[in-house]
Amino acid sequence: LIIGFGISGRHSITVTTVASAGNIGEDGILSCTFEPDIKLSDIVIQWLKEGVLGLVHEFKEGKDELSEQDEMFRGRTAVFADQVIVGNASLRLKNVQLTDAGTYKCYIITSKGKGNANLEYKTGAFSMPEVNVDYNASSETLRCEAPRWFPQPTVVWASQVDQGANFSEVSNTSFELNSENVTMKVVSVLYNVTINNTYSCMIENDIAKATGDIKVTESEIKRRSHLQLLNSKAS
């Protein structure tokens, strides 16, 4: 969480951003909130990116003002117009690119003053893993697959029964480049699986951590997976 304050000469207002990550090829959100104003006419929102000459986005007098927008963001940005009046300056970024990573500044002017805060935006690829029993294998085998990751993640297996066990000797992980030549498909196979146990396939890079769980009993198979973005620090 980054909290910024205003500039001298006018009252300062508090602006708050949250470091976040974007999944390339999908839409992302750069979070920014500020002390709300009661009227829209005086609110100006400017998004800037370090090293980029033009603006990422500008909203003023109740509408987008995109004449100074940098070419790399053309047609890809939007604020939540109905929420500006209540202090939400967050930016929707369409079709996130690897090159969108960097330091952004959310700069706000209202009738009460000015303020700004920086935001670190990471980009990469992350997806939910799915763990299945591999019935084609000669022994009891689990297969963990996740379609899109970048940068290359680490994969670690764990089990509820054998807590702390190292499964690196009985697992095999491969990374297959996807057609767009950036992201990769992750496939990890775990051998010598025992029944009545819960296994977890944990995939992690510096952007996200995802876990796929599978519980195998004689009568049923239960699956669960979740994904968590790392480094969501507020400013």
Epitope: E35, I38, L40, S41, E61, I85
Partner: antibody, heavy 115, light 107 residues
């Protein structure tokens, strides 16, 4: 669930003053504006003013300057409006409404000015 | 002050009808217009903010459109419970101002 609680009604004498309250519950209190709106019987809505709960900074409709004074007590999550030198023209329902979109409204306080 | 003019004080309709209420601002207010519904003896309720954004939990038969000075609020298929007074309001500049209201009534 956000709720704004206001007293149902109050009877005051001409020339007197009254302090109306609006107690908020169910959400963070200080990060919003609290607006006050007047509605005379059978009439439309008039914005009196608003107060930013975090700082106590306020904005008034010029028409109500000198008539209404807005204040806030963050410890009790309550916004107040003082109405002074009351006349029959001030007899109305007074609503508090939270944030700059007027997303949540209190039930209103009926102020009757009568001798 | 910005004047918000609702051309109809009363609007007669039948259940199932499509009905539109107009509101004109005396100057450009961008999309800073909200619409509220007030039923007899009740507080107003926010339906539409920023001209066209339906507020949380508001049925999708209610829509808003417009920008600049001309705004429209539409109920695609009027239900009995929609009979109420509808107000437009601008939050572009202070003082915040409301239209005089349009009473929706049964024919």
């Amino acid at each position: 669930q956000v709720q704004l609680q206001q007293p149902g009604s109050v009877l005051v004498r001409p020339g007197a003053s009254v302090k109306l309250s609006c107690k908020a519950s169910g959400d963070t209190f200080t990060t919003y504006w609290m607006n006050w709106v007047k509605q005379r019987p059978g009439q439309g809505l008039e914005w009196i003013g608003g107060i930013y709960l975090n700082s106590g900074s306020s904005e008034y409709n010029e028409k109500f300057k000198g008539k209404a004074t807005l204040s806030v007590d963050t410890s009790s999550s309550t916004a107040y409006m003082d109405l002074s030198s009351l006349t029959s023209e001030d007899s109305a329902v007074y609503y508090c409404a939270r944030d700059s979109r007027f997303s949540y409204w209190g039930q209103g306080t009926l102020v009757t000015v009568s001798a | 002050d910005i004047v918000m003019t609702q051309s109809h004080k009363f609007l007669s309709t039948s259940v199932g009808d499509r009905v539109s209420i107009t509101c004109k601002a005396s100057q450009d207010v961008s999309t800073a217009v909200a619409w509220y519904q007030q039923k007899p003896g009740q507080s107003p309720e926010l339906l539409i903010s920023s001209a066209s954004y339906r507020y949380t939990g508001v049925p999708d038969r209610f829509t808003g459109s417009g920008s600049g000075t001309d705004f429209t609020f539409t109920i695609s298929s009027v239900q009995a419970e929609d009979l109420a007074v509808y107000y437009c309001q601008q939050h572009y500049n202070t003082p915040l101002t409301f239209g005089a209201g349009t009473q929706l009534e049964l024919k």
